[in-house]
Interface confidence: low
């Protein structure tokens, strides 16, 4: 039901849901630090703009008694319980930051009259697409799907001369929250990815995956999986792999490939890694010292959520417009704002756009090298290395179906 908002008379509050069930196992203290760092920046920006207002955050913690799995499985009710808590206390801010779990976001969106914007660090699933007052600051599954279809169809690059129309997807149910929804989207029979592919089979057992690597009767040479190199090694080990197998490892929120002196292990030679172009300024900021590279994106999304709110607040205040209106709630999309480490672009549906990067392992240097980049905003691929030192024959990616000639 409708809750009055603490959002007027020069005082603007942000409600931050601190849920025990989270897309990433990040200590809530680190997220608090990220939010507080964001608040400092917002206050400075508003002051510089001559806007003498107060901006604060209220952290809403759940009791954690019932919903304590720690992952997203029991997040649906936790989100609604927190909303009830806000409602009872009449403590709703101008904007709601969190939740990060797809289940809880979907349910909260359904069960509330959203006259306020909701900003999420996560909510990766397709069920959270196209929500009018929801903004997602980490790449959702739809963006991954569009890249994969674009890449599958590409056939005019020196290193990729075949269109692909087939794939295996490895999904064993132990994935992290982001991977779970990414693979879920690829598995869904009604998704864009499934619609565009002629053949797609989900491998659910380790043995199924391992058998495909050398199976002469396999229906596709391409296997998509999600996780880090260690996850792949646990599954693949040092097993022999047919020379025309291509493993696409989706590992978006992992900066380790870009660190100096990183050498790619031998088992990565048949692998293309899809990750995000790294940020730059989190390396030595106060709140990120305790974060692993894989957690930076999550904390950064919270921080950027605060900066996004500050950006919109500034625009509305400068235009003399009311904050507690549907117009404000629907405004958090189709824009670029100054994020913590550079411009952040949101698409027409409030989802973050980014530069995805496809890496390969150079057989010469054993380093990860950039094969191409992909701009999710314009759905366009930019080739980077025109003569890659691949493990594959003739330094070209193989056809997706063995024995099929040029198309």
């Amino acid at each position: 039901s409708q809750v009055s908002q603490n959002c007027h008379n020069g005082s603007y509050e942000i409600s931050v849901l601190m849920m025990g069930n989270s897309a990433f196992a990040e200590p809530l203290k680190n997220l608090e630090d990220a939010v507080n760092e964001g608040l400092e920046i917002v206050r400075g920006r508003l002051q510089n703009a001559g806007l003498n207002v107060t901006v604060n955050a209220t952290f809403m913690y759940s009791d954690g008694l019932i919903h304590n799995s720690g992952d997203c499985r029991s997040s649906t009710c936790e989100g609604l319980d927190l909303l009830r808590k806000i409602s009872n206390a009449q403590r709703m801010g101008c904007v709601l930051i969190g939740p990060s779990c797809t289940y809880s976001t979907f349910q909260m969106y359904l069960d509330t009259e959203l006259s306020y914007p909701m900003i999420s660090a996560g909510s990766f699933g397709l069920s959270c697409d196209y929500k009018e007052t929801l903004t997602r600051l980490m790449s959702p599954a739809r963006k991954l799907m569009y890249f994969l279809v674009n890449f599958w169809k590409t056939n005019d690059l020196p290193f990729k001369t075949y269109s692909w129309s087939t794939s295996y997807v490895y999904k064993n149910g132990t994935e992290t929250e982001d991977c779970f929804w990414y693979l879920n989207a690829l598995e869904a029979s009604v998704s864009y990815f499934s619609h565009e592919l002629g053949f797609k089979v989900v491998l659910r057992q380790d043995k199924e995956f391992q058998d495909i690597l050398m199976d002469h009767n396999r229906k596709s040479n391409v296997i998509i999986m999600c996780g880090g190199p260690e996850f792949l090694y646990k599954l693949k080990g040092d097993r022999a792999v047919a020379e025309d197998i291509v493993i696409i490892l989706v590992d978006l929120f992992n900066d380790q490939y870009f660190e100096d002196n990183v050498t790619a292990p031998d088992y990565m030679k048949n692998v293309l890694v899809l990750t995000l172009s790294p940020g730059n300024s989190l390396l030595n900021s106060s709140f990120s010292r305790n974060l692993s590279p894989t957690k930076r994106d999550f904390a950064l999304a919270y921080l950027n959520g605060i900066l996004l709110f500050g950006h919109m607040l500034k625009i509305f205040l400068e235009n003399g417009e009311n904050i507690t209106t549907p117009k404000f709630a629907h405004a958090f999309r189709n824009l670029t704002f100054e994020g913590y480490d550079g411009p952040v672009t949101l698409d027409d549906w409030g989802d973050v756009d980014s530069t995805m990067v496809l890496l390969y392992t150079s057989v010469d240097t054993k380093k990860y090298k950039v094969l191409l980049t992909y701009d999710t905003h314009v759905n366009k691929t930019y080739p980077v290395d025109m003569s890659p030192t691949f493990t594959w024959k003739n330094s070209k990616l193989p056809n997706d179906i063995t024995g099929r000639g040029p198309q």
């Epitope: 490939y257 870009f258 660190e259 100096d260 172009s277 790294p278 940020g279 730059n280 480490d341 550079g342 411009p343 672009t345 980014s354 530069t355 990067v357 890496l359 380093k367 990860y368 090298k369 950039v370 094969l371 980049t373 701009d375 930019y382 080739p383 980077v384 290395d385 025109m386 890659p388």
Partner: nanobody, 133 residues
Framework: QVHLVESGGGVVQPGRSLRLSCAAS????????RGWFRQAPGKEREGVAT???????SYADSVKGRFTISQDNSKNTLYLQMNSLRAEDTAVYFC???????????????????????????WGQGTTVTVSS
Amino acid sequence: QVHLVESGGGVVQPGRSLRLSCAASGYTGRRLCRGWFRQAPGKEREGVATITLSGRASYADSVKGRFTISQDNSKNTLYLQMNSLRAEDTAVYFCAEVRSADAEWLNPLKCHPDRLGLAGVDWGQGTTVTVSS
């Protein structure tokens, strides 16, 4: 090899503005960042501003707040809007394209004009900007 052609230079009074353009042709697929550099008479070439493929801009401290770098990917053109020009901005301005396939190049820190190593960079011929009353 990428062919870069700068234009828009000229003589301008202090405090006025100028906009430089740089048209790129040839293969630009390995571009990870483009930028503007300048070389004043008797001085070393220095970074002014850079912009990554995804649009992240960085500036040398001496031009921050006065200069704006932008790009139009559809026209393959780079721009430098120079406002509040000063006498010390007098120099030959070069457009540059940084090309490398190493993953580490995508780190925007390594694309900052102050930190940019000049290996793997294609240069234009330069356009002269003179700020004088």
